[in-house]
Interface confidence: low
Amino acid sequence: SDKLYQRKEPVISSVHTKVKGIAEVTENVTEGGVTKLGHSIFDTADYTFPLQGNSFFVMTNYVKSEGQVQTLCPEYPRRGAQCSSDRRCKKGWMDPQSKGIQTGRCVPYDKTRKTCEVSAWCPTEEEKEAPRPALLRSAENFTVLIKNNIHFPGHNYTTRNILPTMNGSCTFHKTWDPQCSIFRLGDIFQEAGENFTEVAVQGGIMGIEIYWDCNLDSWSHHCRPRYSFRRLDDKNMDESFVPGYNFRYAKYYKENNVEKRTLIKAFGIRFDILVFGTGGKF
Amino acid sequence: SDKLYQRKEPVISSVHTKVKGIAEVTENVTEGGVTKLGHSIFDTADYTFPLQGNSFFVMTNYVKSEGQVQTLCPEYPRRGAQCSSDRRCKKGWMDPQSKGIQTGRCVPYDKTRKTCEVSAWCPTEEEKEAPRPALLRSAENFTVLIKNNIHFPGHNYTTRNILPTMNGSCTFHKTWDPQCSIFRLGDIFQEAGENFTEVAVQGGIMGIEIYWDCNLDSWSHHCRPRYSFRRLDDKNMDESFVPGYNFRYAKYYKENNVEKRTLIKAFGIRFDILVFGTGGKF
Amino acid sequence: SDKLYQRKEPVISSVHTKVKGIAEVTENVTEGGVTKLGHSIFDTADYTFPLQGNSFFVMTNYVKSEGQVQTLCPEYPRRGAQCSSDRRCKKGWMDPQSKGIQTGRCVPYDKTRKTCEVSAWCPTEEEKEAPRPALLRSAENFTVLIKNNIHFPGHNYTTRNILPTMNGSCTFHKTWDPQCSIFRLGDIFQEAGENFTEVAVQGGIMGIEIYWDCNLDSWSHHCRPRYSFRRLDDKNMDESFVPGYNFRYAKYYKENNVEKRTLIKAFGIRFDILVFGTGGKF
């Protein structure tokens, strides 16, 4: 509450997060022309990345393009990309949607379609939909521990969200345990009125707001965090503005002295921890 | 504008960026003692890294040290590093400029020069200039989509920079399209009065400032972002303070059961998105 | 100092860090059943990661799990995890402490102990203590250069912590050189009243606070940074809340067409650079 007599100061904050959980992923794997069901286990080293404290990312879905090599190949025949003759293909042209630089030749993509040849990582990435349901949909049951250290330098006051009295096996609940700083990812979405299973397909950004309203006067001292959750990406976003949250990264390797890569388009939830508030003192 | 009667509140912000573009790189490649011209294509997975929302990095240049292995070898003969006898070399010494730990022996680096032997990743990195012009100079034509979600918690007000009416094929222009949030990298530099081609060689840091001056009173509501650009690194910086922007990273692999690495010194532009402003309400 | 007649404005900041130093690591290496002492050199590409400007990480210790492959194996026999019959093992169960999903079978871990079989990256990570002393304890002698560019947009004022007059071979000292922005990591810990050697074992978070108290009036202009240091993680934290600072990451590779990984549990110091302050002008 606003106490006009107080000297207010914004919070200086540092955050540390730790995600826990294992996902079992079942997907079709093609090897040597044979497709079979593959099971794999993803742990934290597989689905999360060492990011800054105030943000963490959990991969919930992916599309892989394996064994790419730098060469010439037909580009992917997405809408409007097919050709019937070389006239349609412009040497040196880089279509922002494409994944390579055109050579100027129109070549067969498969038995029925022709596309412009490109210099690229080949075969080029297929523009297929993200798998539905999401491959790591069980990430809903992962938990994240959030440690937040705050400082009001002008008041020379420091505290943190985890107190010695807290129980390390607790789970945050708005009513029953509002001070517990271990959060189940599915609960965060539920609190924000969002459907984890749905968002996991394309990815998204979820805000975890930590609000510190601190009264630092000795006679009415109060300084504990309040947690709230809201979705930060626009779920109604137009296709052209890249809805959801994804990024591409590559694993490079050599085979028979040829540099190759596996391209992974990773969809997932980026959690942004937004710490704000003020410390007031007479 | 300052309305003294209003209750002002700082902005809470979350940013998501998406870079698009392909670069064709031509460089001399030496294999088996033969040097020839090599062409390669770089896409987003090759030149950018999954960083936090409020920063993104675009590699514009690089120097590679391939096939390094942990062993003993002569250090690079940079200015002041040559020796004529073992007396010049101190066992256990780590020169901050060097890349290894001296063994105490002075050994031939090539036919004409001797340097102190070091325990290091060998052969040690050559201290050569960054290629000029920059290898990925065409990154000037890459574009970045910036999505910014803001919140004034005290006023319980949320908005974003991308409106449903926006056109996904727009490009930001200060005069013609100041609300478009797709930016051509070259334009950002031009707006900041900087030369992309020049900065791309050594790298640099570019600030994209998003200023929200929001009047949240219903009778004169206004809340849209203003974009401005300024260079954040010091272009006149003394050599000793590491001008430009670069970092080293490694790709590790095994060959004949020996761990090896390719060391990449990546030069590039780090773009920092600095969101600030206030929301005022009577 | 508070000048009530001044219009105060918070600082907008951008940070760039550069770590320098080499560590020699000696550890027991087992190959083909034979254990011998291995020496290796770690340079910046090995112990640090390209993070955002306002944070950097220096690995000071690690535990490796080499040659893991996705299969079935007994889980690690940590306290409470042993079994004597299949009844103790629940098919499909994921213990948050475990690294896999139980198959329902109780199998021998070694000659004396049995544990539940799991589907996981195998062999599962041994839950052993972080090496003591820390493997990269010599990181105490690494240095970090911190470049900080600040801006008060309302006052249209920009400056930075590195001035042209500064000496690039200086080292920060609270009394003798308080404006030098090259910091020895060990000195940062000493200033904060912490023991680097101790913290390096389990890792931790260290805050480097840069306080700008700027008087921008022309007649009494002053705008230089003040550096201070404080530990941000809780050294007295209960085991259940994950004391110290570590994260796991993996290096993936293929061997005989089987995907394998080396899992690294990296302990280290995350340095958070917290920039704050105000610019005041009449």
Partner: nanobody
Framework: EVQLVESGGGLVQAGGSLRVSCAAS???????MGWFRQAPGKEREFVST????????VYADSVKGRFTISRDNAKDTVYLQMNSLKPEDTAVYYC?????????????????WGQGTQVTVSS
């Protein structure tokens, strides 16, 4: 199904001693065994545990140096010798068995529980 039966509880003066026993209805030689206690109005808490072969023992800080746990696998019985008893040791003492051979202080690691025996320490 293993049944555990505690005995030996009772009333004792502060500073006195007591030995409680726990007999199993089936072979428990490969089990780890433990003692827990619950004072009126409080949660059940760990007291002590012993591994299958008696090599590993663990004690709660509050009883260290005063209580001793032991076992006789031939008789499938576990004992808790309590010396220098204090009024705060007053509680119902439960014997617990775990099919794991390893020692554990966690209640949920124990599959089998006795009905409990009352120990009262008067001042």
């Amino acid at each position: 199904e293993v049944q555990l039966v505690e005995s030996g509880g009772g009333l004792v003066q502060a500073g006195g001693s007591l030995r409680v026993s726990c007999a199993a209805s089936a072979r428990t030689g490969s089990y780890s065994m433990g003692w827990f206690r619950q004072a009126p109005g409080k949660e059940r808490e760990f007291v002590s545990t012993i591994s299958w072969n008696g090599a590993d023992t663990v004690y709660a800080d509050s009883v260290k140096g005063r209580f001793t746990i032991s076992r006789d696998n031939a008789k499938d019985t576990v004992y808790l010798q309590m010396n220098s008893l204090k009024p705060e040791d007053t509680a119902v003492y439960y014997c617990a068995g775990s099919i794991t051979s390893y020692v554990s202080t966690w209640q949920h690691d124990y599959e089998y529980w006795g009905q409990g025996t009352q120990v009262t320490v008067s001042s």
